[in-house]
Amino acid sequence: SASSRRRQQSRNRSTQSQDVARVSSASDYNSSELKTACRKHELYVSFQDLGWQDWIIAPKGYAANYCDGECSFPLNAHMNATNHAIVQTLVHLMNPEYVPKPCCAPTKLNAISVLYFDDNSNVILKKYRNMVVRACGCH
Amino acid sequence: SASSRRRQQSRNRSTQSQDVARVSSASDYNSSELKTACRKHELYVSFQDLGWQDWIIAPKGYAANYCDGECSFPLNAHMNATNHAIVQTLVHLMNPEYVPKPCCAPTKLNAISVLYFDDNSNVILKKYRNMVVRACGCH
């Protein structure tokens, strides 16, 4: 029917993926951006550089990584976008002055174990949660 | 001892919270930044504005909200920062050209129920996850 055709067109226009949207699959680098799409970047953090060498015994540093890149339309499958991020992207395109693009943030984080001196100079082995970025997405 | 005093000073300098850091409590507006700190902003999304009115029957729109604001040093308790975000903030201060600040992203998302026409014009009631921002944090 004409109304179901119109619904289909409207749905296609609105671009969606996952539950809320069938976002058209774009390459990892969005052509509309000089900046690359949201992804994980490698970053080694030295505890000496942070000035923590006097209380952290081991390790000397760790691969923390970080997330960076654009969350631009269309959000592809690699971007692990939430439904909210998809909606926000569409609202940003309509209203860029007031609503920002979603941001590129960690979606999976791992722990590391750290051997350190506590305030009383005791040696402690402790697991610190959410220290290493394993994956990034648009949120 | 002198070494434990040095450790204490180094620890205080490094500013931390939660597990990894005792971040000093800052006001919601960071003095080093004019931009307000990471927080939830209200946003009502009209499905008509998105061009979805022909296939979404109800609701006509919803309070989606969004996250925006700075994730600047020092990260306070309101910012729900992960350990990684705290480390990244310190690395950004040392190396702002290469490592960005953490970004302000949803930490709690809610679902909404939507009544819509599917491709075959059947009326479907479906719960869409991660549609509403309930809380924001630095990630």
């Epitope: 052509s31 951006e33 000089l34 309509m94 209203n95 002055e97 | 931009k35 307000t36 504005d49 604001g69």
Partner: antibody, heavy 121, light 111 residues
Framework: QVQLVESGGGLVKPGGSLRLSCAAS????????VHWVRQAPGKGLEWVGR??????????EYAASVKGRFTISRDDSKNTLYLQMNSLKTEDTAVYYC????????????WGQGTLVTVSS | QSVLTQPPSVSGAPGQRVTISCTGS?????????VHWYQQLPGTAPKLLIY???ERPSGVPDRFSGSKSGTSASLAITGLQAEDEADYYC???????????FGGGTKLTVL
């Protein structure tokens, strides 16, 4: 009703400075992003820059042609937008408009009448 | 050189239909950003004519309509009237700089 009124235009020598004002009334000024747009005589519209809301830390962005020379500011308590123009060049000669950005689709829904800035020796 | 490209001039007789094109790129119109159209009558400030591709502010006659496809947008004016003689500008955003971009303007002459 919504009104934007620019003032402060005039004749200035190259290298000189000028400060334009835009007085807003009839709406909650602090809730709107506002821009400066200029139009050289007989030419098209050229975007100059914008200033965002307190929420955004009053962040200002500028066109490449004016960056480093022009500064946009706002005083929400006075419902006024400003454009500080330094190191003026002859090519800055134009009518300068302030414009309000509407909140749902980001179009410039209200414009001032404009103020003429002439840079000439 | 404007980021958005418009024809410098178009003309039509009263009652006719004219269209004005606005061509951008993948970093502005093609990136999905809204397109707005402004009318500038001689000696006056610009006025918002079409916003969000195709919506008319109150008071704008339905003779004016807008559309967008790919990296281009267009403004159509039907039933041309003498008072439509003006300059018309398209405007969007450019994501490579997150800045406002205008077309160079089109002078409409009603014959």
């Amino acid at each position: 009703q919504v009104q934007l009124v620019e003032s402060g235009g005039g004749l200035v020598k190259p290298g000189g400075s000028l400060r334009l004002s835009c007085a807003a009334s009839g709406f909650t000024f602090s809730s709107y992003v506002v821009h400066w747009v200029r139009q050289a005589p007989g030419k098209g519209l050229e975007w100059v820059g914008r200033i965002r809301l307190e929420t955004h830390g009053y962040a200002a962005e500028y066109a490449a042609s004016v960056k480093g020379r022009f500064t946009i500011s706002r005083d929400d308590s006075k419902n006024t937008l400003y454009l500080q123009m330094n190191s003026l060049k002859t090519e800055d000669t134009a009518v300068y408009y302030c414009a309000r950005v509407e909140r749902s689709k980001s179009g410039f829904d209200n414009w001032g009448q404009g103020t003429l800035v002439t840079v000439s020796s | 050189q404007s980021v958005l490209t418009q024809p410098p001039s178009v003309s039509g007789a009263p009652g006719q239909r004219v269209t004005i094109s606005c061509t951008g790129s993948s970093s502005n119109i093609g990136a999905g950003y809204s397109v707005h159209w402004y009318q500038q009558l001689p000696g006056t400030a610009p006025k918002l004519l079409i916003y969000g591709q195709s919506e008319r502010p109150s008071g704008v006659p339905d003779r004016f309509s807008g559309s967008k496809s790919g990296t281009s947008a267009s403004l159509a004016i039907t039933g041309l009237q003498a008072e439509d003689e003006a300059d018309y500008y398209c405007q969007s955003w450019d994501s490579s700089q997150t800045l406002v971009v205008f077309g160079g303007g089109t002078k409409l002459t009603v014959l």
